[in-house]
Amino acid sequence: TLNSVLINSNAIKNLPPPLGGAGGQPGSAVSVAPGVLYEGGNKYQTLDNYQPYPCAEDEECGSDEYCSSPSRGAAGVGGVQICLACRKRRKRCMRHAMCCPGNYCKNGICMPSDHSHFPRGEIEESIIENLGNDHNAAAGDGYPRRTTLTSKIYHTKGQEGSVCLRSSDCAAGLCCARHFWSKICKPVLKEGQVCTKHKRKGSHGLEIFQRCYCGEGLACRIQKDHHQASNSSRLHTCQRH
């Protein structure tokens, strides 16, 4: 196993990401040597700088995106898949991940999932609460979903270390980030903490331990005393705008 690099009280192992691609073919045995993940799909790209962002599953895209073949609305079909913008309320969908945050896929349509639509006691609990009586009408299409609403217990936000599907599943100050073959709630990064910045879109490779993004008012920038370092080893930290 690789040696741990311990920075800012986070055990993160660094591996230079391979160029291009989403880092691993479906079904392939992936090495257990983790790197760190990108800052969430096309979230930080401007329109004039837009490049298709390759992905293998919804989890690799931003919270306002889903993974799909550009010519089709569904992930999992043959060919290259990229991160596409999520679908707004009342738009057609095939799974929850296709709908924008605050919505879920019901009967093929993106519907609001805010709790005011459910009487207390009938509110459905999110995936992070680990109950799984999910018989959603959108289920069974064979595609990965990002939001599952299940059970009869009042929804509570996931604490650090809880399984999640998107950041809205997590408590304040936490984001939903990849961790091994799952996603868990992790702390949003504070000032001075090491962050991940990938210049080359689609170069995030295989990353097992994803870092959260920088907190409000912070940006992921090269640490000043690391300017002389080689390109590959430049350290990025969360800094004030």
Epitope: A11, K13, V32, E57, N130, D134, K186
Partner: antibody, heavy 115, light 108 residues
Amino acid sequence: QVQLVESGGGLVQPGGSLRLSCAASGFTFNNYGMTWVRQAPGKGLEWVSGISGSGSYTYYADSVKGRFTISRDNSKNTLYLQMNSLRAEDTAVYYCARTIYMDYWGQGTLVTVSS
Amino acid sequence: DIVLTQSPATLSLSPGERATLSCRASQNLFSPYLAWYQQKPGQAPRLLIYGASNRATGVPARFSGSGSGTDFTLTISSLEPEDFATYYCQQYGDEPITFGQGTKVEIK
């Protein structure tokens, strides 16, 4: 309710192969990463392998890497563990479980590797 | 690999007593990525605690988890007859995922 049911265990000779299955129900299967854990007779728990919700990413313990293959068929709500080049030390009850901390477990299936 | 050492190996207590089980990691976990399981003979394990201190669905309030860094604790405030079992801790913060060797809680 959530149910995980393993099958495919049995007696096999060293060097042989087995394919374990885990049928899942009661939850949206492809929302969850899945895990295989084993327990040798009278011993503790050992993580074996894990797979992401879509099946795109797979992970293995060093002790089984190159010999075992985890996979899933989301259309059938089924998780698999293909075990090749089996050794005596692979003898154990194999459990499938849901997600990275295992919130639901199957009842287990016994794999015995012996000549 | 992170080695989890559970102590004591066996805990002999009477119903109604408080049980304190320890799980010590060989390296700092840095984040509360630790779970506790209960296993009875001939049965599959059952998740009790995840994220070091979050009770899993349906787990009675007498079970609580605490700790950070290298030292974690599972406390059963008042033992019920059905609590006599073996308890395992598991870390999911670093690769590979590892379990402790278990603590058996037996009736005194």
